[in-house]
Interface confidence: low
Amino acid sequence: QPPPPPPDATCHQVRSFFQRLQPGLKWVPETPVPGSDLQVCLPKGPTCCSRKMEEKYQLTARLNMEQLLQSASMELKFLIIQNAAVFQEAFEIVVRHAKNYTNAMFKNNYPSLTPQAFEFVGEFFTDVSLYILGSDINVDDMVNELFDSLFPVIYTQLMNPGLPDSALDINECLRGARRDLKVFGNFPKLIMTQVSKSLQVTRIFLQALNLGIEVINTTDHLKFSKDCGRMLTRMWYCSYCQGLMMVKPCGGYCNVVMQGCMAGVVEIDKYWREYILSLEELVNGMYRIYDMENVLLGLFSTIHDSIQYVQKNAGKLTTTIGKLCAHSQQRQYR
Amino acid sequence: SAYYPEDLFIDKKVLKVAHVEHEETLSSRRRELIQKLKSFISFYSALPGYICSHSPVAENDTLCWNGQELVERYSQKAARNGMKNQFNLHELKMKGPEPVVSQIIDKLKHINQLLRTMSMPKGRVLDKNLDEEGFESGDCGDDEDECIGGSGDGMIKVKNQLRFLAELAYDLDVDDAPGNSQQATPKDNEISTFHN
């Protein structure tokens, strides 16, 4: 084994390197010293390092490590951040188009239900957006509210347009009758199933992407322990103390140090792998009623069918509701 | 009040969404994301190696630094860490992850559980009990390409899925949630997802 080269007799090289790290030369000895106070770069002979230099090296080593970690994850982080934003925006666009389709359907097929229907449709799709973004709204409630709101308008405008003005405050009775008499058949239940399944999947997909960002951010900004800082210092900087400015760490040694420093981070690996595979499984299942694009863009059609169902049974329903809500029609809540 | 857009009259004849083949859809974009993510599946286990390969390490030099002294690159001492008595690497590993890492592992476990729960069996599209009332409109069959056809005059025929991010600017909002002024300014007299 070759003997180590003699240390720089004047510590000049060390000083010029250290000056780049820390302007002001107070901490670098003029000539090699015993270095008995050193705790990391334990000298085998005279050294060009002081305790203060060692501390600075430790700080720099930890900063280097943090930067390396951040550059390692940059591409992955950008991939997830960009996609999370793109999908969130895309889902909002789908919701907006679905709302436009539904409003257009009312405008074309049931103009007498507008403008009220626009408001109910608007609130429904607002809640859809909020749900996707994580709001704790119940999908069944959303759908029930849509049909509860629509039915009084359908009843007074389509089924029974001759109702006098004084009778228009039977809203509450009609809302109740909507459920009790199942006036829309099983369409609300169909919509509930489709909407809740597709929105749940969409919501968890976005949640998963946002958690992916959180995972990267967490490991990106990890503060490394003092022990790790010492190991890194010893690997990257202790050679300088002996005037060995150009020498690099051994590859195997670097791997051992990094595994030590990253023991905690590497524990994420198992769950990270599972995360990607589970996300893949979810994505593979996102079609038909598990695909919000498919479901929401087709809602206008199902709502149209549900109104046709009511119209088909209008005669029977009008008689039943006439009796059921008779007392409500005399009451005025103005 | 301009709350409702009374000028939003849509010509029934143009309520057709163009059939566009080979467009990038949300589902193709999702699959593309997964493929890219899969290339990062070993990200965490590969980190130590990645960082070593991106920091100064002796590759072609004969001599390298092992933490204590200059040694030949392929000698036994090269892999030894030169910390024999000072820092016990095993101890460092035994400490376990930082609290923030443990926390994020718990969150990953939770989302993985949710993702597994949500990954559906590829069975029937609709629940059987939805067929009870005999819809006249015809339910979607399992082999159908889509479940969003139209019925009645002036229905919008949506042949394939929304072209992915076809036009971010296009907006025919009839209401303005969450602020809700509901002032619409239709940019066209048709509702078409696909503008050229």
């Epitope: 909002e92 408001e119 109910f120 608007g122 609130e123 607002t126 809640d127 709204i137 409630d141 959303m142 029930n144 509210e145 509860d148 709101s149 405050d169 809203n171 509450e172 809302r175 809540y333 103005r334 | 709350y3 907006d171 909002d173 209401d175 303005d176 949630a177 969450p178 602020g179 809700n180 002024s181 509901q182 002032q183 619409a184 300014t185």
Partner: antibody, heavy 121, light 112 residues
């Protein structure tokens, strides 16, 4: 004429409970979203809670979540705010406010005269 | 949460003069379809707040046209031309873009 009349304000000890009511008239109550807004002693206005026209959806300020419950009885044209685990920082004038339309996302257009809640030991 | 800032706690003005009251939001209140969800309320002494301006620049019914609202996505101004004695009170701005709904601290209009 739209009228909103709040009642139920009182002095209570910290940890106590109270229910505020708001009687609405002059409009079809069931068609409008409603909110409670409070004004603290330093004259700051603070949104407390919102309920939509049908009563299906409710929204709360973080500081009152789990302690306050907004509800409505459309048959009685009345809005309620059930308050429990009261704290001194809940001391304020509580206003009942109507939204411009049925959605919880419409802006405030009418305010009641307010009812005062004092929480002190 | 969106923070609404009204920097001036009070503004003194002579009757008949014009005055501007400003308000800032920590996030743009411009909705994707072009509406800006900023509202102005006036609370006269001993009274409840009343709506003056909705969606940044629209005058609420019954409000004199001496009042006007303007602004960008995050900086807003309420202007009163020819101030009258009945305009005295505290002016609050409020955002209704997203929950939680938030108000500014208020600006008191005082007559000199």
């Amino acid at each position: 004429e739209v009228q909103l009349v709040e009642s139920g304000g009182d002095s209570v000890k910290p940890g106590g409970s109270l229910k505020l009511s708001c009687a609405a008239s002059g409009f079809t109550f069931s068609s409008y979203g409603m909110s409670w807004v409070r004004q603290t002693p330093d004259k700051r206005l603070e949104w407390v809670a919102t309920i939509n026209s049908g009563g299906s959806y409710t929204y709360y300020q973080d500081s009152v979540k789990g302690r306050f419950t907004i509800s409505r009885d459309n048959a009685k044209n009345t809005l309620y705010l059930q308050m429990s685990s009261l704290k001194s920082e809940d001391t304020a004038i509580y206003y009942c406010v109507r939204h411009h339309y049925g959605s919880s996302y419409d802006y405030f257009d009418y305010w009641g005269q307010g009812t005062t809640l004092t929480v002190s030991s | 949460d969106i923070v609404m800032t009204q920097a001036a706690p009070s503004v003194p003005v002579m009757p008949g003069e014009s005055v501007s009251i400003s308000c800032r939001s920590s996030k743009s209140l411009l909705h994707s379809n072009g509406n800006t969800h900023l509202y102005w309320f006036l609370q006269r002494p001993g009274q409840s707040p009343q709506l003056l301006i909705y969606r940044m620049s629209n005058l609420a019914s019954g409000v004199p046209d001496r009042f006007s609202g303007s602004g960008s996505g995050t900086a807003f101004t309420l202007r009163i031309s020819r101030v009258e004695a009945e305009d005295v009170g505290v002016y609050y701005c409020m955002q209704h873009l997203e929950y939680p709904l938030t108000f500014g601290a208020g600006t008191k209009l005082e007559l000199k």
